[in-house]
């Protein structure tokens, strides 16, 4: 058992049938050493008395607020919740896994530059009594900061049958420098509460490798004289560091009908212009990539040839 | 400690195309790295993040470009000296802070050359002969260097009498080319800023 | 299984001009550009120019313009190659070449020789 | 127009040995180049697109690499049906233009 927060404990239980389950022994946080009460949530029924209640948690109806009171008044409580480990492996039931970029992928994060800002996200089908915390640092054995905000809901989404729920949290290394060379990770580690079950989710990640630049912007197009072909530009995202001389992109400029099935016109540039074949009911998009270190493709920009 | 913006004529940097196919060819070795010894713990998630010129040159906080000067984040105490005569330095009135920043690169470069050659004479002892570094690789190497034409003393290889140990050395390869990578990086991103302005 | 089937061998007087045909199998016709490349005996690879069979848009090879006109018949699947103002060194094997990409080619007609001499 | 330049023109190689050819252009064209092979009598057949994109039914074998100016076609190791001529193609802009060739010869 660990404590979680304030009056908020963790017991790590193997999950199994007739597994024999942890022996927890609650302290009533007061002064007074006789006359206390326990009970378990809303319940009256008293589940023992004394400065202490040692009990046997086995499953979730051993898990809640426990509150020990004397002659009617609260003294203190301590609410218990369960970490299931099946087969030696941590449960996780809360969160979806996203699969992307491989199986067991439940926290996903992106960054739009090299500032030390990343943004992560998570799925759920859950929606009610939930509650996340999320801790994230730079290496683990002499860890250095990184702060990060609440985790809100984000979106919403209708997934067949079900609904799902995504949640997101802003981070920002405490002091980064856009051109320095990582050697230690950022760990990111997401603390999940559902009614009383607990799970933690962790990822671990190099800023370089989560790099997704914004979609290139202002983009417009000149057509060229006697010929089929159009001068498309555009420029860097006001988000992509700075200089751009030194965090430089390279670029892919394709011409699509509305179906992926459809012929197109593509090139690659590190240039913020192109010439492409511009068709009827056709679209000109570019997106942007880092030109030195190949993390993900921007978004797409797009305009239509018309 | 970083590079002014007024330095050579544009398009008269002849490192920075040394510099791109220096990428392209560690990129690719450690791509034929990862396939070959895909048995052995060398993806970026699986190794340590090792520097063999920390505390040796400081090529990010030298080579920094002005803007991010004023980011107190960037500017790390540690100071090198070094020899500062470059052909690379296409112009009289560059200062002695780019010269400091490209004579870092020379140095990191030495570096990594005396480890890949040391590597590879290792290697070619292993009877699997799994793996050897990619000669185009080391011709990259060298011919940044020459274009970079920094005096410095020479690295002795080093040469070792007891018996290779192949399996620590190919995680030692790995480990080597993804930092090496990350260098290559820099030096190609430093280059671009120093042909841009 | 797509395929680009051409015509038959020619032999043309300098000064005539020359059609060649490609019909394609396989596929929506209108779904892919159609290019024009020629090879000279023993020489390299010369792209002449590209049709859009859906709209008849063309672009050809500065080398080529005023000379050459490439055209496609949807309802038969087939593109048409018409070189004119023959010289001797126009003697090559033209093929047709398709792709849903615009700038590169995935799939080769056989090609067909065309021997310009006097 | 961008002219392509390959190198060697002639490449002699003994079965089951590597082999690259090189393939220059006049400026920079980024990663807008392609690799063909070409058997005598027969069509092109595309082998590499975008200077790396391996094409599914292309031996892994082949490999290409390379962005900017200078490119690289890569055979691991050459089998019998590998001996052909080799052709690069850009596709920055147009017209659209190849390399010379290069022929991989039985040593």
């Known amino acids: 058992i660990w404590e979680l927060k304030k009056d908020v404990y963790v017991v790590e239980l193997d999950w199994y049938p007739d597994a024999p389950g942890e022996m927890v022994v609650l302290t009533c946080d007061t002064p007074e050493e006789d006359g206390i009460t326990w009970t378990l949530d809303q319940s009256s029924e008293v589940l023992g008395s004394g400065k202490t209640l040692t009990i046997q948690v086995k499953e979730f109806g051993d898990a809640g607020q426990y509150t020990c009171h004397k002659g009617g008044e609260v003294l203190s409580h301590s609410l218990l919740l369960l970490h299931k480990k099946e087969d030696g492996i941590w449960s996780t039931d809360i969160l979806k896994d996203q699969k992307e970029p491989k199986n067991k992928t439940f926290l996903r994060c992106e960054a739009k530059n090299y500032s030390g800002r990343f943004t992560c996200w998570w799925l759920t089908t859950i929606s009610t009594d939930l509650t996340f915390s999320v801790k994230s640092s730079r290496g683990s054995s002499d860890p250095q900061g990184v702060t990060c905000g609440a985790a809100t809901l984000s979106a919403e989404r209708v997934r067949g049958d079900n609904k799902e729920y995504e949640y997101s949290v802003e981070c920002q290394e405490d002091s980064a420098c856009p051109a320095a060379e990582e050697s230690l990770p950022i760990e990111v580690m997401v603390d999940a509460v559902h009614k009383l079950k607990y799970e933690n989710y962790t990822s671990s990640f190099f800023i370089r490798d989560i790099i997704k630049p914004d979609p290139p912007k202002n983009l417009q197009l000149k057509p060229l004289k006697n010929s089929r072909q159009v001068e498309v530009s555009w420029e860097y995202p006001d988000t992509w560091s700075t200089p751009h001389s030194y965090f430089s992109l390279t670029f892919c400029v394709q011409v699509q009908g509305k179906s992926k099935r459809e012929k197109k016109d593509r090139v690659f540039t590190d240039k913020t212009s192109a010439t492409v074949i511009c068709r009827k009911n056709a679209s000109i998009s570019v997106r942007a990539q880092d030109r030195y270190y190949s993390s993900s493709w921007s978004e797409w920009a797009s305009v239509p040839c018309s | 400690r970083n590079l002014p913006v007024a330095t050579p004529d544009p398009g008269m940097f002849p490192c920075l195309h040394h510099s791109q196919n220096l990428l392209r060819a560690v990129s690719n070795m450690l791509q034929k790295a990862r396939q070959t010894l895909e048995f052995y713990p060398c993806t970026s998630e699986e190794i340590d993040h090792e520097d063999i010129t920390k505390d040796k040159t400081s090529t990010v906080e030298a080579c920094l470009p002005l803007e991010l000067t004023k980011n107190e984040s960037c500017l790390n105490s540690r100071e090198t000296s070094f020899i500062t005569n470059g052909s690379c330095l296409a112009s009289r009135k560059t200062s002695f802070m780019m010269a400091l920043c490209l004579s870092s690169i020379y140095e990191d470069l030495k570096m990594y050359q005396v480890e890949f050659k040391t590597m590879n004479a290792k290697l070619l002892m292993d009877p699997k002969r799994q793996i050897f570094l990619d000669q185009n690789m080391l011709a990259v190497i060298d011919e940044l260097m020459q274009a970079l034409n920094f005096n410095s003393e020479t690295v002795p290889q080093k040469s070792s009498l007891e018996e290779p140990d192949f399996y620590k050395t190919k995680i030692k390869l790995c480990i080597l080319l993804h930092a090496f990578r990350i260098r290559a990086v820099t030096i190609d991103r430093v280059m671009s800023y120093l042909n841009a302005s | 299984q797509v395929q680009l089937v051409q015509s038959g061998a020619e032999v043309k007087k300098p000064g005539s001009s020359v059609k060649v045909s490609c019909k394609a199998s396989?596929?929506?016709?209108?779904?892919?550009?159609l290019h024009w490349v020629r090879q000279a005996p023993g020489q390299g690879l010369e792209w002449m120019g590209w049709i859009d069979p859906e709209n008849g848009d063309t672009e050809y090879a500065p080398k080529f313009q005023g000379r050459v006109t490439i055209t496609a018949d949807e309802s038969t699947s087939t593109a048409y190659m018409e070189l004119s103002s023959l010289r001797s060194e126009d003697t090559a094997v033209y093929a047709c070449?398709?792709?849903?990409?615009?700038?590169?080619?995935?799939?080769w007609g056989q090609g067909t020789l065309v021997t310009v001499s006097s | 127009d961008i002219v392509m330049t390959q190198s060697p023109l002639s490449l002699p190689v003994t079965p089951g040995e590597p082999a690259s050819i090189s393939c220059r252009a006049s400026?920079?064209?980024?990663?807008?180049l392609h690799w063909y092979q070409q058997k005598p009598g027969q069509a092109p057949r595309l082998l590499i697109y975008?200077?790396?994109q391996s094409i599914s039914g292309v031996p892994s074998r082949f490999s290409g690499s390379g962005s900017g100016t200078d490119f690289t076609l890569t055979i691991s190791s050459l089998q019998p049906e590998d001996f052909a001529t080799y052709y690069c193609q850009q596709s920055n802009s147009f017209p659209l233009t190849f390399g010379q060739g290069t022929k991989v010869e039985i040593k």
């Open positions: 396989g596929g929506t016709f209108s779904d892919y550009y």
């Open positions: 070449a398709r792709n849903k990409e615009l700038r590169y080619f995935d799939v």
């Open positions: 400026q920079s064209i980024s990663i807008n």
């Open positions: 975008f200077a790396s």
